[in-house]
Interface confidence: medium
């Protein structure tokens, strides 16, 4: 089940066969980018 919040690495954060580039292309705002990288880096 879910509940965790920290990403082990960029590769682990990619789902639905998406590439990092495709995710970047669909993040629509500064807030979206900030949130994505906040989770990606494990909030450190």
């Amino acid at each position: 089940g879910g509940g965790g919040s920290k990403h082990k690495c960029v590769q682990n954060s990619l789902v639905n066969n998406e590439t990092l580039e495709s995710i970047m292309n669909t993040l629509e705002s500064e807030e979206d980018f900030r949130k994505y990288f906040y989770y990606l880096e494990g909030s450190k």
């Epitope: 919040s5 954060s13 789902v15 995710i23 807030e31």
Partner: antibody, heavy 121, light 107 residues
Framework: QVQLQQWGAGLLKPSETLSLTCAVY??????HYWTWIRQPPGKGLEWI?????????NYNPSLKSRATISVDTSKNQFSLKLSSVTAADTAVYYC???????????????WGRDTPVTVSS | DIQMTQSPSSLSASVGDRGTVTCRAS??????LNWYQQKPGKAPKLLIY???SLQSGVPSRFSGSGSGTDFTLTISSLQPEDFATYYC?????????FGQGTKVEIK
């Protein structure tokens, strides 16, 4: 075990400011976004906005001009202020934790107990 | 905003029946779709995330499927505690939006 405890004024007059606070007990405050969601009587759920421990926020554009979410990391608390309330803001308000397992794969996995707010003259 | 539309709005069923709730997104949200259960006077509870992943502690009779714009929540054999309102929610983009809910009632 992580718990969310929320509180705030339950009865407001039109044009006043709604103020709610949610405290996080027993778990990590960083590493998550913390969210406010509301539910008008007999209706569905509406996402208000969210904040992380750094103070970065996202808001629902439908409320952005009136909603302010803030954080107090020293107390593991976050708060919602909603200005110029009307009867349409009458709802049950929830605070919630957002969990994440992957990019854009986030979900509300822990909720506080409801805080009913009524706006009436 | 991404609009989420659930059907039916209410579902009458008996204990042991199979229950199915559908959710349609107004645009492609891939599998960024979550399902919640809410009982009267209680906060919603996460059941399914990422369209098909079962949240820890949720009984295996609950399952989710779908991708793109069409999603399904299935309860394989309804139990008395399953009679509640179910909401879908997209996490593809802000503002995060919910379906209007499906109330599963005892026939």
């Amino acid at each position: 075990q992580v718990q969310l405890q929320q509180w705030g004024a339950g009865l407001l007059k039109p044009s006043e400011t709604l103020s709610l606070t949610c405290a996080v007990y027993g778990g990590s405050f960083s590493g998550h976004y913390w969210t406010w969601i509301r539910q008008p009587p007999g209706k569905g759920l509406e996402w208000i906005g969210e904040i992380n421990h750094r103070g970065n926020t996202n808001y629902n554009p439908s409320l952005k001009s009136r909603a302010t979410i803030s954080v107090d990391t020293s107390k593991n608390q976050f708060s919602l202020k909603l200005s110029s309330v009307t009867a349409a803001d009458t709802a049950v308000y929830y605070c919630a934790r957002e969990g994440s397992l992957a990019a854009r794969l986030w979900f509300f996995d822990l909720w506080g107990r409801d805080t009913p707010v009524t706006v009436s003259s | 905003d991404i609009q989420m539309t659930q059907s039916p709005s209410s579902l009458s069923a008996s204990v042991g029946d199979r229950g199915t709730v559908t959710c349609r997104a107004s645009q492609n949200i891939r599998t960024y779709l979550n399902w919640y259960q809410q009982k009267p006077g209680k906060a919603p509870k996460l059941l399914i995330y990422a369209a098909s992943s079962l949240q820890s502690g949720v009984p295996s009779r609950f399952s989710g499927s779908g991708s793109g714009t069409d999603f399904t929540l299935t309860i394989s054999s309804l139990q008395p505690e399953d009679f509640a309102t179910y909401y879908c929610q997209q996490s593809y983009g802000t503002p995060y939006t919910f379906g209007q809910g499906t109330k599963v009632e005892i026939k």
